[in-house]
């Protein structure tokens, strides 16, 4: 690395992946192993995040960017940059303070995370229940009862699920 020349701050020309080394007359030095600088003009390099324990490495650290972690199997990320891991539950369950609990009757969860959500109320759209809901799946709404009378034709597709509320605890 050449010594930078700047009338203002000699460090401003140090690129990402380097730091301005005061111990070496403000020469731009490369970041040491297991550290990075994501912007230019840095006077120090930041220590790379290590993905250990419940975390695993999604993206390795480089001289210009930090490592990125995700969670080991059985957990999923929470928070900005996966700052925590939360335990997975099975489909048909939600995570409570006492652990994974089955969805109450009338609610469902089709994922390993999140809350149980109420089944769609088909009658709100004037439709009937074509397929009953389960703990893992929402109901499927079919044509309205009037559409099923003799002479009625086409089957309307199910209405999109409404924005769910919290399930009762």
């Amino acid at each position: 690395f050449e010594r930078t020349r700047s009338l203002q701050d000699p460090c401003s020309n140090c690129p990402a992946g380097t730091f301005c080394d005061n111990n070496r007359n403000q020469i731009c030095s490369p970041c040491p192993p297991n550290s990075f600088s994501s912007a230019g003009g840095q006077r120090t390099c930041d220590i790379c995040r290590q993905c250990k324990g419940v975390f695993r490495t999604r993206k390795e650290c480089s001289s210009t960017s930090n490592a990125e972690c995700d969670c080991t199997p059985g957990f999923h990320c929470l928070g900005a940059g996966c700052s925590m891991c939360e335990q997975d539950c099975k489909q048909g369950q939600e995570l409570t303070k006492k652990g994974c609990k089955d969805c109450c009757f009338g609610t469902f969860n089709d994922q390993k995370r999140g809350i149980c959500r109420p089944w769609t109320n088909c009658s709100l759209d004037g439709k009937s229940v074509l397929v009953n809901g389960t703990k893992e799946r929402d109901v499927v709404c079919g044509p309205s009862p009037a559409d099923l009378s003799p002479g009625a034709s086409s089957v309307t597709p199910p209405a999109p699920a409404r924005e769910p509320g919290h399930s009762p605890q």
Partner: nanobody
Framework: QVQLVESGGGLVQPGGSLRLSCVAS????????MGWGRQVPGKEFEWVSG???????DYADSVKGRFTISRDNAKNTVYLEMNSLKSEDTAEYYC??????????WGQGTQVTVSS
């Protein structure tokens, strides 16, 4: 920057004891629930024990009655006293920030091996 430094692991015979320590820095320790978890290669990470900021403790069924968690807010340290150790306690042990169901591990871990 959050830092957790675990220590106290080692090789111990079945029935023996160990005391793990975790020194924390980079956050307000006294306000945060802390804990311990463990990882055996090829198995799911297992939460072991936790202690709230008020000192309320909680344990996994597999260690209840054998392990004791405690904290010293003046020293920013959380401890895990492990007695009556069994071969199935062999694992890498990690200090945790957070509760029983959601937490983060920010240290290198300390290896505990229970073997005769």
């Amino acid at each position: 920057q959050v830092q957790l430094v675990e220590s106290g692991g080692g090789l111990v015979q079945p029935g023996g004891s160990l005391r793990l320590s975790c020194v924390a820095s980079g956050f307000v320790f006294s306000t945060v629930t802390m804990g311990w978890g463990r990882q055996v290669p090829g198995k799911e990470f297992e939460w072991v024990s936790g202690v709230s900021s008020e000192g309320i403790t909680d344990y996994a069924d597999s260690v209840k009655g054998r392990f004791t968690i405690s904290r010293d807010n003046a020293k920013n340290t959380v401890y895990l006293e492990m007695n009556s150790l069994k071969s199935e306690d062999t694992a890498e042990y990690y200090c945790l920030i957070g509760g029983r169901w959601s937490f983060g591990t920010w240290g290198q871990g300390t290896q505990v091996t229970v073997s005769s």
